[in-house]
Interface confidence: low
């Protein structure tokens, strides 16, 4: 009897299930939380997509708990955000805490759960569009007219507290054009645009984005008619062209007029240090440009020659107070590239401030929407603006004045000061990274042991940076290129202030023949340009040891007095034995260290590279 009842029950259940399945009645499909957004870090809303309803009425509920807490809660408000949403009011929103949430779908046949979503309010901010967009054509006298754009931040956002940093982007296009022209405005709430087509009607929009989070929608378009006479006065144009042409002509004439060594010293200021490539006089006379460039250290890295095979070198010292060290390329493109701008021309290498964690925004140390836990709850949505040509990392852009912090590939952040013309100091530092790298390793033939681990990478990237930089015109593009390619650990070398020392009457010119293995400089008198060909170096009778510095000539040539007794050579050797080299060095540098180790006072530390202070030598020789 019992068996019959049991079998009947089982049969009834199976029949019921079969009927349900035939009627298409199933448990609900798995829902998915696809998007969470906050307009202002004070409230936020999440939306989900229902799964299949199983052919039955389905109820959805969102439950959540906060990281580190065990209490489970249900969504406080299913209404405000519309269908399939959960809105968290101020009372339920907290910054810097992770919400772990899931959606439960239930019908008569059962229930299913979404995957858990990890949400940090900080990273889901999407502000409302900026307000009060005003556009105006400005036509100042004798200057190019421009479009002036102004706007206000969205009302929900309190910028005064510093709780929020908003970045803005402007886009504009002629009414009938297909493509938008996009300009990044940083934190400014106004912007000038110069390059516009006269007689066209333009659409202008602006949007904003917090330091972390998403771009707002574009503001409603504002239309502006560009006048047909939106060009500079013809006379102004012609005057500009004429002046420019005159300047170019003068430069060419001057360059052609100057010959030989004087031309070289003007165009390529001397670089300090004992192992700097000079020029063979033959090169200048015969005009072998390739060899000349090679001598200037312009060849590719790494060096192929041993130090013994180097060209004849000159020891040159800069005695001017206001002229800083510059690498040989520095005048080729002084206006290009990133210029690290410092208000004080101090003697700090800048390295410390590159690495100092206190200088970097704390935000930079936060996870970049931590891929393991914070999946982007908008993966299914199309990007809002596929036409946008660049993406600003939501993580690491934090404007302080006009110095943004950019993400440099890893979790570190790099500080790259933007070019700020108003602050440019007459004694500004190196013009680009390549120059720094080339100075750091010395001439191409010199061993490159200065650079730290990451600094070595800078050498590889310096060529690409140089070639990329030369074509860049706007700050924005510079910023973008550095955003993507700069290396945090590239050392910034700042030039030392020169110690002035008195120059005496010139006695002789000298050439460094070589650095002996025992550490002494082998020097020989240099023939004057007009006295015919110089004697070939290497002839024994010409090799003299010099030990006294008499003075420095006007054009920064170090003048040494021959010492027949060569007493000081021994002194060099003695002091060399006592002074350990400051860096791991190869043979050439050890020899060089012997020479430079005369006195600890005679070294100027520059980002790890040793420089000779001629003032010191003057004292030690006398």
């Amino acid at each position: 009897m019992k068996e019959n009842v049991a079998s009947a029950t089982v049969f009834t259940l199976l029949l019921f299930l079969n009927t349900c399945l035939l009627n298409g009645q199933l448990p609900p499909g798995k829902p998915e939380i696809f998007k969470c957004r906050s307009p202002n870090k004070e409230t936020f809303t999440c939306w989900w997509r229902p799964g299949t309803d199983g052919g039955l009425p389905t109820n959805y509920s969102l439950t959540y708990h906060r990281e580190g807490e065990t209490l489970m809660h249900e969504c406080p408000d299913y209404i405000t955000g519309g269908p399939n949403s959960c809105h968290f009011g101020k009372q339920y929103t907290s910054m810097w805490r992770t919400y772990i949430m899931m959606v439960n779908a239930t019908n008569q046949m059962g229930s299913s759960f979404s995957d858990e979503l990890y949400v940090d309010v900080t990273y889901i901010v999407q502000p409302d569009p900026p307000l009060e967009l005003a556009v105006e054509v400005k036509q100042p006298e004798d200057r190019k007219p421009y479009l002036w754009i102004k706007w206000s931040p969205p009302t929900l956002i309190d910028l005064k507290t510093g709780w929020f940093t908003l970045l803005y982007e402007i886009r504009l296009k002629p009414e009938k054009a297909a493509e938008w022209e996009i300009h990044f405005a940083g934190q400014q709430t106004e912007f000038k645009i110069l390059s516009l087509h006269p007689g066209q009607k333009y659409l202008v929009q602006v949007r904003c984005k917090p330091d972390h989070g998403y771009w707002s929608a574009w503001s409603p378009a504002t239309f502006i008619q560009i006048p047909s006479d939106f060009t500079m006065n013809d006379t102004t144009v012609w005057i500009s062209v004429a002046v420019l042409s005159a300047v170019i002509c003068l430069i060419i004439v001057w360059a052609v007029a100057l010959k030989g060594y004087s031309m070289v010293t003007c165009i390529f200021p001397p670089v300090p240090g004992p192992k700097i490539k000079g020029f063979d006089a033959h090169l200048l006379e015969k005009g072998k440009s390739e060899e000349l460039l090679s001598a200037l250290g312009c060849q590719d890295f790494p060096p192929t020659s041993d130090y013994e095979d180097l060209l004849v070198e000159y020891l040159e010292v800069d005695d001017s107070e206001d002229q800083h060290l510059m690498s040989v390329h520095s005048k080729e493109h002084p206006s290009q590239g990133m210029k690290p701008t410092y208000l004080d021309p101090d003697t700090d290498s800048g390295r410390g401030s590159c690495d100092s964690p206190s200088l970097l925004s704390e935000k930079c140390e936060e996870p970049q929407a931590n891929p393991s836990t914070f999946y982007d709850p908008e993966v299914i949505e199309k990007p809002e603006n596929p036409e946008t040509t660049h993406t600003w990392d939501p993580q690491c852009i934090s404007m302080e004045g006009k110095i943004p912090y950019f993400h440099a590939g890893g979790s570190k952040c790099s500080t790259w000061p933007l070019p700020q013309p108003s602050q440019h100091n007459p004694r500004s530092s190196y013009h680009n990274i390549t120059d720094v790298c080339e100075l750091a390793v010395g001439p191409a033939g010199a061993p490159a042991t200065l650079l730290n681990e990451a600094g070595k990478d800078a050498l590889k990237s310096s060529q690409t940076i140089k070639s990329r930089e030369e074509g860049k015109a706007t700050q924005q593009r510079e910023v973008e290129s550095f955003h993507s390619e700069t290396d945090q650990d590239t050392p910034w070398l700042l030039p030392q202030e020169k110690t002035p020392f008195g120059s005496a009457k010139p006695l002789d010119y000298v050439e460094i023949h070589k650095v002996n293995k025992d550490g002494a400089l082998s020097l020989l008198p240099k023939q004057r340009e007009n006295s015919g060909k110089p004697k070939k170096p290497g002839t024994p009778e010409n090799n003299k040891e010099y030990a006294k510095v008499s003075g420095v000539m006007d054009n920064n040539i170090l003048v040494l007095v021959p010492d027949p007794h060569a007493k000081n050579v021994a002194c060099f050797e003695e002091s060399a034995k006592e002074a350990p080299p400051s860096l791991e060095q190869n043979q050439a540098e050890k020899a060089l260290a012997n020479f430079t180790a005369t006195s600890s006072k005679c070294r100027l530390q520059l980002g790890g590279l040793d420089y000779l202070d001629p003032a010191c030598f003057t004292h030690s020789f006398h």
């Epitope: 109820n59 299913y78 009372q91 907290s94």
Partner: antibody, heavy 121, light 113 residues
């Protein structure tokens, strides 16, 4: 006027059933969680059950779990409490109360006048 | 479940005097993330339903006289009536709404001495 009015209370024998109703007016009923609270004669307040806003997720005190069922009809602005297997310990004044938010974890900012349920043989 | 314990069970205070009622929860009802205590105080007069006095442990409900104040955080809370009036005679209940079941304290009966 914002108010809650309970009904359906009365005398019932042990093991019997009763269905309480709470008619809401003066606010958007579906936007708020609703709660039943009871108070035995001369005793304190006891939270019985709650239901969330539009979705209708339900929560119960251990003492009534499996016997009581809370439900709501948002189209009628009415809250219900179906009470089965009643015992003498269920004798109490039953209050219907409105939560201040959509979910149940909110304070109760509006109370009905209550309906008395007496379980006695 | 979170257990709420009120003390004293009853309290007699002179008119115009200060009355203090305590409430202790077995677990913290403070959410550190939003710094809110999920605790409320109700007043129930004889023959009437309860009335909301204080929400979020210390926020007075609109229309409630300012002689009523709530304080405390975590597990220990206090309701204070700074100057007792005749109409304040009632039973006072605390309730936590941090975690279901949303439990009440057993109540404190306040009388005039």
């Amino acid at each position: 006027e914002v108010q809650l009015v309970e009904s359906g209370g009365g005398l019932v024998q042990p093991g019997g059933s009763l269905r309480l109703s709470c008619a809401a007016s003066g606010f958007t009923f579906s936007s708020y969680a609703m709660t039943w609270v009871r108070q035995a004669p001369g005793k304190g307040l006891e939270w019985v059950s709650a239901i969330t806003g539009s979705v209708g997720n339900t929560y119960y005190a251990d003492s009534v779990k499996g016997r009581f069922t809370i439900s709501r009809d948002n189209s009628k602005n009415t809250l219900y409490l179906q009470m089965n297997s009643l015992g003498a310990e269920d004798t109490a004044e039953y209050y219907c109360a409105k939560g201040a938010g959509m979910t149940t974890n909110w304070y109760l900012d509006l109370w009905g006048r209550g309906t008395l349920v007496t379980v006695s043989s | 479940d979170i257990v709420m314990t009120q003390s004293p069970d009853s309290l007699a205070v002179s008119l115009g005097a200060r009355a203090t009622i305590n409430c202790k929860s077995s677990q913290s009802v403070l959410y550190s993330s939003n710094n809110q205590n999920y605790l409320t105080w109700y007043q129930q007069k004889p023959g009437q339903p309860p009335k909301l006095l204080i929400k979020w442990a210390s926020t007075r409900e609109s229309g409630v006289p300012d002689r009523f104040s709530g304080s405390g955080s975590g597990t220990d809370f206090t309701l204070t009536i700074s100057s007792l009036q005749a109409e304040d005679v009632a039973v006072y209940y605390c309730q936590q709404y941090a975690s279901s079941p949303y439990t009440f304290g057993q109540g404190t009966k306040l009388e005039i001495k």
